[in-house]
């Protein structure tokens, strides 16, 4: 495949990414695919700046993100590593709620209104960011 | 790689408390909750309760409650639980295990309940 | 708070055996059943969660299935090592309960 060395339309270059922001609901799982059909996975947040880019356009409502405990620990999708990553938890989170009766805890991690991050039910239908990175290889066959 | 590890085993006089300790390494220890599960010997494995180690809330079996405490320190990355008015059926082993989906266990702590 | 109920409480079987576990939930846990296999003097090990997804670095010999009340765990083809005790549990709704426990004999 051809490297992408721009933007598809209606994506956000920021940072030698490129952010697709939904402007409807999605289960996380639903979320997930998505972005992977769009040779994207949903957005990976690895430093304090890229969190301000991502905060500033998803404005103050939940949205999800690309990290969730679904197998055990917790990890990004792209397999950055959660431990020695960067995190923005909100105070008390994760906590694995079980008192919302839906069954089961809260795997999957989302943006909330004030852009730090809480653990939620993976089926809830929030919008959500996809991101690819530029320097990536397309999917693409390159044109002759 | 991801640890949890236990205090040693202890013997007890009916009426006291016992105190076990659960000190994880190998992961950031607020992303998990900490969970107690017992086992007296030969038997079953029965389930105390759980300890968010962010906020410190917790959640106890209603058996246990009022008998139970589970705290922690955040600066040593280790859970704690306490048992108190002990009496030999208390005696068992205890486990602390991550998540309640337990991917990780202690090895194990044996309390003995006896005069 | 939701009973489990695990069957048989002990079986003999062979080396190179299919064996199959059964756990019963006295009410709908939708997915959320997972097992686990103790060895003596040993902690519990998660063999498989969520209904039949394998925990990392468990042979897939083990596998999972069901949904809402019935589910079984399968040992397709027994090795020595698997002459232990199997436990199933629920984390579908709090408190956290755990099915009685069989024990795979050697007949």
């Known amino acids: 495949g051809s490297e992408r060395t721009c933007c598809p339309v209606n994506w956000v270059e920021h940072e030698r990414s490129c952010y697709w922001f939904s402007r409807s609901g999605k289960a996380w799982a639903d979320a997930d695919n998505y972005c992977r059909l769009e040779d994207a996975h949903l957005v990976v947040v690895t430093s304090w700046e890229e969190q301000k880019f991502v905060q500033h356009h998803i404005g103050p409502v939940n949205t999800w993100m690309g990290l969730h405990d679904q197998n055990g620990p917790w990890k990004w999708v792209d397999g950055t590593d959660y431990e020695t990553g960067f995190k923005n938890w909100r105070p008390e989170q994760p906590d694995d709620w079980y008192g919302h009766g839906l069954g089961g805890g809260e795997d999957c991690a989302h943006f909330t209104d004030d852009g730090r991050w809480n653990d939620d039910v993976c089926q809830r239908p929030y919008r959500w960011v996809c991101e690819t990175e530029l320097d990536k290889a397309s999917q693409e066959p390159p044109l002759l | 790689q991801v640890q949890l590890v236990q205090s040693g085993a202890e013997v007890k006089k009916p009426g006291a408390s016992v105190k076990v300790s659960c000190k994880a390494s190998g992961y950031t220890f607020t992303s998990y909750d900490i969970n107690w599960v017992r086992q007296a010997t030969g038997q079953g494995l029965e389930w105390m309760g759980w300890m968010n180690p962010n906020s410190g809330n917790t959640g106890y079996v209603q058996k246990f409650q009022g008998r139970v405490t589970m705290t922690r320190n955040t600066s040593i990355s280790t859970a704690y639980m306490e048992l108190s008015s002990l009496r030999s059926e208390d005696t068992a082993v205890y486990y602390c295990?991550?998540?309640?989906?337990?991917?990780?266990w202690g090895q194990g702590t044996l309390v003995t309940v006896s005069s | 708070d939701i009973q489990l109920t695990q069957s048989p409480s002990s079986l003999s079987a062979s080396v190179g055996d299919r064996v199959t576990i059964t756990c019963r939930a006295s009410?709908?846990?939708?997915?959320?059943l997972n097992w686990y296999q103790q060895k003596p003097g040993k902690a519990p090990e998660l063999l498989i969660y969520a209904t039949s997804n394998l925990q990392s670095g468990v042979p897939s010999r083990f596998s999972g299935s069901g949904s809402g009340t019935d589910f079984t765990l399968t040992i397709s083809t027994l090795q020595p090592e698997d002459f232990v005790t199997y436990y199933c549990q629920q984390s579908y709704s709090l408190p956290v309960t755990f099915g009685g426990g069989t024990k795979v004999e050697i007949k």
């Open positions: 009410q709908s846990i939708s997915k959320y």
């Open positions: 295990a991550r998540k309640k989906t337990g991917d990780y």
